[in-house]
């Protein structure tokens, strides 16, 4: 760090009070899926119990914008968030034991990008440090995965289904089923990040219906069948 | 951006006093990092001084410690130099300069030369 | 405190050739939290000193790949693997894990 306080000694070459951050190069994720961005300091201060602060920023360090902000109160291991970017931050380490880990969810292409972290001493040791290097993430593209299919009761004793997919670039969504012309016209919804969720409407005949979700990177496929009994509702997946 | 200027007398009589100016801009020096002072001899031999730190704590040279001191005008976002009892031996360029956490000056002034002569 | 030795002193290169620069320390500049804290600038006539390399081996920002660093304990090196006509000037090195902090004495790189 820009050095410590120096003990009002004369010797000659004292060690610099200096912090040092651990940080990997690089983390690799796919999107979608949740990564862990690892930080670990020493600092020079012994056993400091005071405030802390502790800062994850994007983008450049020292100004880079923060995406994740905690506080711990003097002498508690609690963290508490004051900042989370889209709520998709979370400490995972302890800052008390130098450890300052977080946790991305729901990983985006937009989410690429070099990371940084920061912890601050707000008490008498007032001093901070922050990587300069920080951790280069790298989110991957990922191919379909549907996540969730289903039949669920509709309007006037009809059936509807519903699709969900995930995938990035988001997965274009489309239903097939019985005949005739074997398709149906689908809603789709909007999507949440890298979500889709498609819906049909109204099943109006037995059999199977198909959830196909696509992108560039692949295709994937799941199905429902419907069946009714004695002319009462049912279904059967 | 973050620039830092010197400013200073120029001309010091010999056992005077010396006091220079390091107005920095782009940054605040309350936020972040140390405030140094470094200085080149004729000859190029630099010799770094000391620095005042964000918070405001000092750590000089020690074979300067008896005469110098480093303090800041934080309304004005300036820090300064104040060097006693100067001698031929102080004329020198006098840089400011900041020093990031990784233990390197990132940012200089331009430097102002000083030269002590009676 | 650390004395910091450059050799050579001096050094004549012609443009393209590959440079070489040698910084001693008296004693060991690993600081006890394992980083060196071990810095090459270089001054050109009439200006403040720039950052080259920074703890040993770390380009920084803006400094083209032609320069590297290494070494550990208290041999170290800066190299230019193409010398270019603005690479002409002052080489330092300096350490910062020891107060008071120290450069080294100087390597002028000039044409041969």
């Known amino acids: 760090d820009a050095s410590g306080d120096l003990l009002n000694t004369e010797a000659h070459s004292a060690p610099a009070q200096r912090w040092s951050m651990q940080v990997p190069a690089e983390v690799n994720a796919e999107a979608g899926d949740a990564a862990v961005l690892p930080c670990t300091f020493t600092h020079p201060h012994r056993h400091y119990d005071g405030p802390l602060t502790a800062i994850w920023r994007s983008g450049e360090p020292y100004a880079g914008p923060q995406v994740f902000r905690c506080t711990a109160a003097p002498g508690s291991e609690l963290c508490q968030t004051a900042l989370s970017l889209h709520g998709r931050f979370r400490l995972l380490g302890n800052p008390r034991r130098n450890d300052l880990s977080l946790r991305v969810e729901r990983l985006a292409l937009a989410d690429s990008g070099r990371y940084f972290c920061r912890v601050e001493f707000t008490g008498d040791a007032h001093d901070r440090y922050e990587s300069r290097h920080g951790v280069r993430l790298r989110v991957t593209a990922a191919a379909p995965r549907i996540v969730n299919i289903s039949v669920l009761p509709g309007p006037a004793h009809a059936f509807r289904a519903l699709c969900t997919a995930e995938g990035e670039p988001p997965p274009a969504l489309a239903w097939s089923g019985p005949a005739p012309g074997n398709s149906s016209a689908a809603l789709q919804g909007q999507g949440h990040g890298y979500q889709v969720t498609a819906e049909l409407p109204a099943l109006t005949r037995d059999g199977r219906y198909t959830c196909t979700a696509a992108n560039s990177l692949g295709r994937a496929e799941a199905s429902v069948y419907l069946f009714r009994f004695h002319g009462a509702p049912g279904t059967s997946t | 951006d973050v620039q830092l200027q010197e400013s200073g007398p120029g001309l010091v009589k010999p056992s005077q006093s010396l006091s220079l100016t390091c107005t920095v801009t782009?940054?605040?020096?309350?936020?972040?990092?140390?405030w140094n002072w470094i200085r080149q001899f004729p000859g190029n031999k630099l010799e770094w001084m000391g620095y005042?730190?964000?918070?405001?704590?000092?750590t000089y040279k020690p074979t300067l410690k008896s005469r110098i001191s480093i303090t800041r005008d934080t309304s004005k976002n300036q820090f300064f130099l104040q060097l006693n009892s100067v001698t031929t031996e102080d004329s020198a360029t006098y840089y400011c300069a900041r020093e990031d956490y990784d233990g390197l000056f990132d940012y200089w002034g331009q430097g102002t030369t000083l030269t002590v002569t009676s | 405190d650390v004395l910091m030795t450059q050799t050579p002193l001096s050094l004549p290169v012609s443009l393209g050739d590959h440079a070489s620069i040698s910084c001693r320390s008296s004693?060991?500049?690993?600081?006890?939290?394992?980083?060196?804290?071990l810095d090459w600038y270089l001054q050109k006539p009439g200006q403040s000193p720039k950052l080259l390399i920074y703890?040993?081996?770390n380009r920084f920002s803006g400094v083209p790949d032609r320069f590297s660093g290494s070494g550990s304990g208290t041999d170290f090196t800066l190299k230019i693997s193409r010398v270019e006509a603005e690479d002409l000037g002052v080489y330092y090195c300096?350490?910062?894990?020891?107060?008071?902090?120290?450069f080294g004495g100087g390597t002028k790189l000039e044409i041969k």
């Open positions: 300096f350490q910062g894990s020891h107060v008071p902090y120290t």
């Open positions: 004693q060991t500049i690993l600081h006890s939290n394992g980083n060196t804290y």
């Open positions: 782009g940054y605040s020096i309350t936020s972040d990092f140390a």
């Open positions: 005042i730190r964000f918070s405001g704590s000092t």
């Open positions: 703890k040993v081996s």
